[in-house]
């Protein structure tokens, strides 16, 4: 009884099972009751990559340099030629029949995966903490500069397209130091005023004073380490000394007691 189905690597023809031709060979004649399937090897520029009953081998793919293609792997009687693209180009499709230039990632985007001969550049948006300020087919998103590690402070925040701008710490320190210095000055001034008040109210135990001309009291004379001859410097900006202005006495005139 003739078979209705055949084993693997066989095919049914004229009510009998014939062997398929192995990869790299084409069918010349089907098997008969007396002979096996006749197969012949594919020629130099041809191939067949499966067990088959093809009467013609397939032509190897041509990697056309005019389309930016070059041979990645030479074809055999069992495999097709594999084409790839020249440097800087990638295949337009899976079959790689022509090539196109790699895409560049715009500013704000970095390269997630560098393009190959068969795949385009894959870009990704730069996440927070990273930036890209160039249009490139190779550069990844770069991390923002760390101002702290350079003993600097952030003067301008970074974006996905720009790096942070770092600056010296002065301004920031000044914001803390100035109020502290002013506070200290204020306390000193207060103490001085209290001291002056006390000195001014001190009674004279010896003889009653005759009426005197108003006199200047140098309240700095009693302060330890003070030089009455030296002008007092104001300390204002960031505790930096400010030079005494010319034509101004550094003494405070005190009104004569009544």
């Amino acid at each position: 009884e003739p078979p209705t189905a055949c084993r693997e690597k066989q095919y049914l023809i004229n009510s009998q099972c014939c062997s398929l031709c192995q990869p790299g060979q084409k069918l010349v004649s089907d098997c008969t009751e007396f002979t096996e399937t006749e197969c012949l090897p594919c020629s130099e520029s041809e191939f067949l990559d499966t067990w088959n009953r093809e009467t013609r081998c397939h032509q190897h793919k041509y990697c056309d340099p005019n389309l930016g293609l070059r041979v990645q792997q030479k074809g055999t009687s069992e495999t097709d030629t594999i084409c790839t693209c020249e440097e800087g180009l990638h295949c337009m499709s899976e079959s790689c029949e022509s090539c196109v230039p790699h895409r560049s990632c715009l500013p704000g985007f970095g390269v997630k995966q560098i393009a190959t001969g068969v795949s385009d550049t894959i870009c990704e948006p730069c996440p927070v903490g990273f930036f890209s300020n160039v249009s490139s087919a190779f550069e990844k998103c770069r991390p923002w500069t760390s101002c702290e590690t350079k003993d600097l402070v952030v003067q301008q925040a970074g974006t996905n397209k720009t790096d942070v701008v770092c600056g010296p710490q002065d301004r920031q320190r000044a914001l803390v130091v100035i109020p502290i210095c002013l506070g200290i000055l204020f306390v000193i001034l207060l103490l001085v005023l209290v001291f002056i008040k006390k000195v001014a109210k001190k009674p004279n135990d010896k003889a009653p004073h005759p009426k005197q001309e108003p006199q200047e009291i140098n309240f700095l004379d009693d302060l330890p380490g003070s030089n009455p001859a030296a002008p007092v410097q104001e300390t204002l900006h960031g505790c930096q000394p400010v030079t005494q202005e010319d034509g101004k006495e550094s003494r405070i005139s005190v009104q004569e007691r009544q």
């Epitope: 004649s29 089907d30 009751e33 007396f34 006749e38």
Partner: antibody, heavy 112, light 112 residues
Framework: QVQLEQSGDDLVKPGASVKLSCKAS????????INWIKQRPGQGLEWIGR????????HYNEMFKGKATLTVDTSSSTAYIQLSSLSSEDSAVYFC?????WGQGTTLTVSS | DIVLTQSPLSLPVSLGDQASISCRSS???????????LEWYLQKPGQSPKLLIY???NRFSGVPDRFSGSGSGTDFTLKISRVEAEDLGVYYC?????????FGAGTKLELK
């Protein structure tokens, strides 16, 4: 119906060459191998060789290499056997066959 | 080369008898695809051989069912259940599995 029509009987001189033909009809010529068989008077059957009309591939019995050359002409569906340097040993009936069908045979006589 | 040994070389029978012819090969004639190309032919005097059995046991079209083939590997048998007058002649076994293809020496079926 399948038929294999062989050329007529031949008488040739020793040392000469001869080309016998076998014209196929009633089937696709390229589908079946053509075998050539030799039978000397009162003897058994000897396989000379075979040819695939589809590819031109040939297989020979070592004993007949250099003696027999098998060819085909697919345009006329005809197979040929050329026998060279003939001697009386080559006197025999030559059959062409595709196994299930046989030609009627050609009697070759080599004699001076 | 594969040698096919037939026995007996001569088989005298009476019409209506059962006849059995053996064919032994010097090595297995199962080919790489698992096929056994063993055939049986009958040649009557002055005629071309005719195919009876192919692939060990398959009867060729038009062959009476009194002919049957069996065997495997290296041992094969042709049986004729009831011999008729038209069955007389020389029977050849033939192997087409391995080149060079070979015939047995033949068994002559004749009347007692």
């Amino acid at each position: 119906q399948v038929q294999l029509e062989q050329s007529g009987d031949d008488l040739v001189k020793p040392g000469a060459s001869v080309k016998l033909s076998c014209k196929a009809s009633g089937y696709t010529f390229t589908t079946y191998w053509i075998n050539w068989i030799k039978q000397r008077p009162g003897q058994g059957l000897e396989w000379i060789g075979r040819i695939s009309p589809g590819s031109g591939s040939t297989h020979y019995n070592e004993m007949f290499k250099g003696k027999a050359t098998l060819t085909v002409d697919t345009s006329s569906s005809t197979a040929y056997i050329q026998l060279s340097s003939l001697s009386s040993e080559d006197s025999a009936v030559y059959f062409c066959t595709r196994n299930d069908y046989w030609g009627q045979g050609t009697t070759l006589t080599v004699s001076s | 080369d594969i040698v096919l040994t037939q026995s007996p070389l001569s088989l005298p029978v009476s019409l209506g008898d059962q006849a059995s012819i053996s064919c032994r090969s010097s090595q297995s004639i199962v080919n790489s695809n698992g096929n056994t190309y063993l055939e049986w032919y009958l040649q009557k005097p002055g005629q071309s051989p005719k195919l009876l059995i192919y692939k060990v046991s398959n009867r060729f079209s038009g062959v009476p069912d009194r002919f049957s083939g069996s065997g495997s590997g290296t041992d094969f048998t042709l049986k004729i259940s009831r011999v008729e007058a038209e069955d007389l002649g020389v029977y050849y076994c033939f192997q087409g599995s391995h080149v060079p293809l070979t015939f047995g020496a033949g068994t002559k079926l004749e009347l007692k």
